[in-house]
Interface confidence: low
Amino acid sequence: IFPLAFFIYVPMNEQIVIGRLDEDIILPSSFERGSEVVIHWKYQDSYKVHSYYKGSDHLESQDPRYANRTSLFYNEIQNGNASLFFRRVSLLDEGIYTCYVGTAIQVITNKVVLKVGVFLTPVMKYEKRNTNSFLICSVLSVYPRPIITWKMDNTPISENNMEETGSLDSFSINSPLNITGSNSSYECTIENSLLKQTWTGRWTMKDGLHKMQSEHVSLSCQPVNDYFSPNQDFKVTWSRMKSGTFSVLAYYLSSSQNTIINESRFSWNKELINQSDFSMNLMDLNLSDSGEYLCNISSDEYTLLTIHTVHVEPSQETASHN
């Protein structure tokens, strides 16, 4: 319709889009309205992602990896919107996408760089290995490689072991810290710089408690305000360590405000819970109740671990009977 000389070649534009694994994203592209619209999306300048012309999609040559995963905003094409809706992105989708748009008066080429990140909620675990005590910060699936930092009593620790397993699409990372014999508080931060997402794990050891048999013990567990947001879903778990493994005494889910108690002598104060105080009582203590008690408050953004050591001693009566 128009001689080639009238075509306007606009310099390449480049945008960066950050997507999250398995979620849907939009690769943006806009153009000046015109008739006879042709839209071609290509990956790395060779793989056909999506083609549209003569008023409809033409996907005969679409690369199989994009089958049923792409669509345009058909009602907005006449308004100059050539953006691509992209379903269920994977790490293999990372790279440069080129959008070629031709109309009767103009040809433009836009470049979009797609970066994909993964950040499955990390966890902080407290483990006993023989006579040693370890804190382990771990994340099952993360991409790109995260930044992990440890602090002891709010002071950064340079020693930082990282056990890393790389798979095709992400990393699995464990960062253990030996805290044997320490009464300090510890903090571990895992940061995904691409997704601008940070998770923090905090561990605090409370002073040991000495109790007599048949007495009751009250163990405190209150979140640190810096991390805690009562509007965000979280879970509180109280557990007791016996012979190296933790058994769950009770847990609370904020989403349903449900409390599940597995130990009949355990009690939680509903009013305190409403004030975000998860301290617990354990009644009628016996000698086998001696050990470590762990309160775990966890959300998508943090894990707060509070540990109490309880020593239950025989009462005078029991001692005199023996």
């Epitope: 060779s46 056909k48 083609s51 003569k54 033409h58 996907l59 005969e60 040559s61 199989p64 089958a67």
Partner: antibody
Framework: QVQLVESGGGVVQPGRSLRLSCAAS????????MHWVRQVPGKGLEWVAV????????DYADSVKGRFTISRDNSKNTLYLQMNSLRVEDTAVYYC?????????????WGQGTLVTVSS | DIQMTQSPSSLSASVGDRVTITCRAS??????LAWYQQKPGKVPKLLIY???TLQSGVPSRFSGSGSGTDFTLTISSLQPEDVATYYC?????????FGPGTKVDIK
């Protein structure tokens, strides 16, 4: 309706060349991927080559790679197969075939075929 | 390259019989599989694509199933006009190989 008409077949000596053509009509040729598939009379189908709708991508069976070239002229609605260094085992009926509209590399229409005989 | 195999290579069945043809890929191909019918002296005809989607105009007695490496073409009630050779074809990536074919005739 879709019509695919192959031509250019015949008897040729080993080592020589032949060019097959396929004239397409009844559909928008430039919108569809096209294939060449061959069949030794009385035997099975063998996929030979494919070309994308805009000619930007081509793929070949290992048995013909480096010897055969698929091409198209969208302005003439014609598909081609340039066959060089022909071998006796290239003897077959050569079909031109069109992609199904919503498909990826499988065909919904076939030509009647043209016979290529490679013999000394 | 991925190899395609079909079984049986030929079969005879009576009119009205249920007939099953199997196609196996040497590696997973998701559901990128098509089935074709070629009657004697005719060109092939597309029956099924995407492993189980019936091409328009194909009788409903034909059905396809499977995903990954194992696929099946079933004719629920064999008719005289179904005498033909049946081919499977993978189309996930080049080369877009056909199976060796299964010849079906009437007892």
């Amino acid at each position: 309706q879709v019509q695919l008409v192959e031509s250019g077949g015949g008897v040729v000596q080993p080592g020589r060349s032949l060019r097959l053509s396929c004239a397409a009509s009844g559909f928008t040729f430039s919108n569809y991927g096209m294939h060449w598939v061959r069949q030794v009379p009385g035997k099975g189908l063998e996929w030979v080559a494919v070309i994308w709708y805009d000619g930007s991508e081509k793929d070949y069976a290992d048995s013909v790679k480096g010897r055969f070239t698929i091409s198209r002229d969208n302005s003439k609605n014609t598909l081609y197969l340039q066959m060089n260094s022909l071998r006796v085992e290239d003897t077959a009926v050569y079909y031109c075939a069109k992609d199904l509209i919503s498909g990826i590399y499988y065909v919904d229409h076939w030509g009647q075929g043209t016979l290529v005989t490679v013999s000394s | 390259d991925i190899q395609m195999t079909q079984s049986p290579s030929s079969l005879s069945a009576s009119v009205g019989d249920r007939v099953t043809i199997t196609c196996r890929a040497s590696q997973g191909i998701s559901n990128y599989l098509a089935w074709y019918q070629q009657k004697p002296g005719k060109v092939p005809k597309l029956l099924i694509y995407a492993a189980s989607t019936l091409q328009s105009g194909v009788p409903s007695r034909f059905s396809g199933s499977g995903s990954g490496t194992d696929f099946t073409l079933t004719i629920s009630s064999l008719q005289p006009e179904d005498v033909a050779t049946y081919y499977c074809q993978k189309y996930n990536s080049a080369p877009f190989t056909f199976g060796p074919g299964t010849k079906v005739d009437i007892k």
